[in-house]
């Protein structure tokens, strides 16, 4: 191969390193919790905010919102990070594309159901148009064991 | 009314082998994960077996692994685990369990008991 | 492989007082994805388990609001607000982040 695309590789390699994928993670699963929850069948009771993940209010990850936030609240958060980080691919696609699969495969095993898992690549793959970003052309979001797990 | 039945309990001697059934009703059974779950005689639940809804995935628990299989029939509706080299701490309520798609057991069968005694 | 340790393992609680049961984890069960992955199920006497509480705060369909799931750390409370004579049972929490397993169960018990 020639050695301007092993050069792409390695700064795709390096940018994908330095990137932080988790609010794009939080933004997605939070997403297709929510349209579950809102279509899917009968909706948890509405007591708390059942769309954010529960913790500790007191914690101090800047992506993960409080459970008390308003509705969808930290959703729109974690998108907004989640599109600063995706920015960073929009001159190469195909490593969008990497940065796409690397939530998939984090996520796959997550979702336990088929709709689950094709409501998610669904969403992922309309994540960088949300973001007013190009779309990777191709982009392959199949994993084929069910994942590896990032925790 | 998403249903699960169990079926293929029994006694079994020690060594022998013994197939176990479940049956979804009620809900598109090709779309989920399902598992076996066990619950010794007056003790606590233990998870024993899962099957992703297109089978690229098996999981065991460590004590069962190379004796159980688990697999499934989608156009049945049917999930199974054949238990081989059975032993005396397999003793246990079993039960087949639906996932919601987000790891949670969702729906559980009522259970079928499997006794290994000689 | 995680362990999960539930206490108290016998709960007597009186109707209409608050209860509560614990569970900690070895390690964290958020995800990458910002859940918490623990549940909590009840096996009321003779019936097969049923689901209470997903990822950690979430009430499964049909659950009274009495019942309520928080986290902290690896930390898991599940808390009923006022116990009625229906919520004996034995109370499980199980972790799903990696494969899954579940605590001890926990014994609620009418004084």
């Known amino acids: 191969r020639q050695q301007w695309e092993l050069q792409g590789d390695r700064r795709c390699q390096s940018q994908l390193e330095r990137a932080n994928l988790r609010p794009c993670e939080q933004h997605l699963m939070q997403k297709i919790q929510r349209d579950e929850d809102s279509y899917g069948r009968d909706p948890y009771s509405p007591s708390q905010d059942p769309y954010s993940p529960s913790q500790d209010p007191d914690r101090r990850d800047p992506y993960s919102p409080s459970p008390y936030d308003r509705r969808g609240a930290g959703s729109s958060q974690h998108q907004e990070r989640c599109c600063n980080e995706l920015n960073e691919f929009e001159n190469n696609q195909r490593c969008m594309c990497e940065a796409l699969q690397q939530i998939m495969e984090n996520q796959s095993d997550r979702l336990q159901g088929r709709q689950q898992e094709q409501q998610f690549k669904r969403e992922l793959r309309n994540l960088p148009q949300q973001c007013g970003l190009r779309a990777p052309q191709r982009c392959d979001l199949e994993v084929e064991s069910g994942g590896r797990d990032r925790y | 009314e998403v249903q699960l039945v169990e079926s293929g309990g029994g006694v079994v001697q020690p060594g022998r082998s013994l197939t176990l059934t479940c049956v979804g009703s009620?809900?598109?059974?090709?779309?989920?994960?399902m598992h076996w779950v066990r619950q010794r005689p007056g003790k606590g639940l233990e998870w024993v077996s899962s099957?992703?809804?297109?089978?690229?995935?098996?999981e065991y628990v460590e004590s069962v692994k190379g004796r159980f299989t688990t697999s499934r029939d989608n156009a049945k509706n049917s999930l199974y685990m054949e238990m081989k080299s059975l032993r005396p701490e397999d003793t246990a309520f079993y039960y087949c369990?639906?996932?919601?798609?987000?790891?949670?057991?969702?729906?559980w069968g009522q259970g079928t008991m499997v006794i290994v005694s000689s | 492989e995680i362990v999960m340790t539930q206490s108290p393992l016998s709960l007597p609680v009186t109707p209409g007082e608050p209860a509560s049961i614990s569970c900690r984890s070895t390690q964290s069960l958020e995800h990458s994805n910002g859940y918490h992955y623990l549940d909590w199920y009840v096996q009321k006497a003779g019936q097969s388990p049923q689901l209470l509480i997903s990822l950690g705060s979430k009430r499964a369909s049909g659950v009274p609001d009495r019942f309520s799931g928080s986290v902290s750390g690896t930390d898991f409370t599940l808390k009923i607000s006022r116990v009625e004579a229906e919520d004996v049972g034995v109370y499980y929490c199980?972790?799903?982040?990696?494969?899954?397993?579940f605590g001890q169960g926990t014994k609620v018990e009418i004084k």
């Open positions: 099957i992703r809804y297109n089978s690229v995935r098996i």
């Open positions: 009620g809900f598109n059974f090709d779309d989920y994960t």
């Open positions: 369990v639906k996932d919601n798609g987000f790891r949670s057991f969702e729906i």
């Open positions: 199980m972790q799903a982040l990696q494969t899954w397993t």
